[in-house]
């Protein structure tokens, strides 16, 4: 429970204005009415409140809106957004992209990745799906924010908006997110020619299955090592030396540089040494010639 103090008559607040910057914390607590603050939120960001004063204003809004702020207040939070926790934001219902833009601008230059991720999640929930307008807003105001969405939220992305996604927007996407986005990208780009298709699908390949990688290896795509290193380990392991050679083309030499890193290291361990030797790269760690490979995982699965 908060310590209650009475507001001195001369400090009574009838308007949210600049005079409040001279109020001490206790005076703000006693004199600023939360309902008045909410009604005049559009004035708050123009007033140079200290962080301590912003804390009081946040607590006032929490008092008024225990179930989460309404969008009419959220859109005018301004720098007060910097005081919000992911738990606060999780209570919100946001549908307006103007609200999203305003808060993304405020968050720039501040360590607020968790808050921004939660905000974007609330927008997607509020709008029913990650539509083209939302995706455009994210790419314009928060490159990389797409990857802050959970795989569950990304599953609502219609394939039609995949074309608007830029490679840099996917830089921070994890495997589970790419697992969701890749099939959508494959669908979105299915009518493109070979080389054009590869350019478009490349940023999404971290979600590609083995069969699709095998198919790509037949198309002279010359995959760069950076893309190869982002492929799913499970998708790379079944590829033969010949398939990897075809997939990488002239970039195959890069395997030597990456031989100690996954997925290259794990893939090497699965290949016959004599097959690896055909690459002429001096890759070591393959299965010695004459050894029989027993896949015990299959037997375990059956028993």
């Amino acid at each position: 429970d908060v310590e209650r103090t009475t507001c001195p008559p001369e400090k009574e607040v009838h308007e949210i204005d600049e005079s409040l910057i001279f109020y001490k914390k206790r005076e703000l607590e006693a004199c600023v009415d939360a309902a008045l603050l909410a009604a005049q939120m559009d004035r708050v960001d123009a007033i140079p409140f200290t962080y301590e004063q912003l804390d009081v204003l946040k607590h006032k809004l929490d008092e008024l809106y225990p179930q989460g702020y309404p969008e009419s207040v959220i859109r005018h939070l301004g720098h007060l957004f910097l005081k919000m926790s992911p738990e606060d934001i999780r209570k919100w219902n946001v549908t307006s992209l103007e609200t999203l833009k305003a808060l993304l601008k405020v968050s720039k230059g501040h360590e607020m990745s968790a808050q921004v991720a939660t905000l974007i999640d609330r927008v997607v929930v509020g709008r029913g799906q990650l539509d083209k307008d939302t995706a455009d807003t994210l790419t314009a105001f928060c490159p990389g924010c797409l990857c802050s969405l959970s795989p569950e939220r990304l599953s609502s992305v219609p394939p039609s908006i995949i074309g608007a996604v830029r490679p840099q927007d996917l830089d921070t996407c994890g495997p589970r997110q790419l697992d969701v986005l890749y099939p959508k990208a494959r669908l979105a780009f299915q009518n493109m020619s070979g080389s054009e298709y590869f350019v478009k699908i490349r940023p999404f390949l971290g979600g590609a299955p083995t069969e699709d990688l095998k198919a790509l290896s037949q198309q002279n795509v010359s995959m760069d090592l950076a893309t190869f290193m982002k492929l799913r380990r499970e998708a790379v392991l079944p590829l033969s030396v010949a398939e990897v050679q075809k997939l990488l083309g002239p970039h195959v030499e890069g395997l030597k540089v990456e031989e100690q890193h996954s997925p290259v290291r794990d893939w090497i361990l699965k290949q016959r040494q004599d097959d690896l030797d055909t690459l002429g790269l001096g890759l070591q760690g393959g299965i010695p010639n004459g050894y029989l490979i027993l896949d015990l995982s299959v037997r375990e699965a059956l028993s």
């Epitope: 429970d1 908060v2 209650r4 507001c7 009838h14 308007e15 607590e29 006693a30 004199c31 600023v32 009415d33 939360a34 309902a35 008045l36 909410a38 009604a39 005049q40 607590h59 006032k60 008092e63 008024l64 809106y65 225990p66 179930q67 309404p70 009419s72």
Partner: antibody, heavy 119, light 108 residues
Amino acid sequence: EVQLLESGGGLVQPGGSLRLSCAASGFTFTHTYMSWVRQAPGKGLEWVSNISPTYSTTNYADSVKGRFTISRDNNKNTLYLQMNSLRAEDTAVYYCARYNAYHAALDYWGQGTLVTVSS
Amino acid sequence: EIVLTQSPGTLSLSPGERATLSCRASQSVSSSYLAWYQQKPGQAPRLLIYGASSRATGIPDRFSGSGSGTDFTLTISRLEPEDFAVYYCQQALGYPHTFGQGTKVEIK
């Protein structure tokens, strides 16, 4: 079910005092702004006062400022209106009402208690 | 203080007719902070419309609200016998949270 039950009204002489109570139930009182609204006989509604849930910040109509005091006891789920220096023009039915911050409106009202100031 | 002026003072209509009530504010009021109430004789007021146009729980759809800035309207599309009452608008933008003086809708 939300219920607001006012009590404490009655006949009082000019200059006298009276304390109104409003017992609340059916909602989280500790999270809710509460208000008093009055209605003089045959007249319209007049907003009197309100109080915030946590900080107990108060606001008053100019006509009652300095004479009336709104307060609450969150442990008892009860709202109060202490009325001092009563005047004939304070004669009215006093309603306790819940302010819904999400609607910015008074969404539940009590049935009212009559205060008569007369000599 | 924000003054709300309602018009007309009294509206004489027959059941089935359309009622249009006006509420004018002395200064601009955000629509989020404008509400309408109905009061019948001997009863407490009842919230009808909040946020200028959203119907409160249990309010029939013949009641609708509109407007922004300084001009707001409550419309009853087809008057039912139980709709004859006094209607008040209220603003909660600034203190005091003033009411209009009311419009009485009576049977012609």
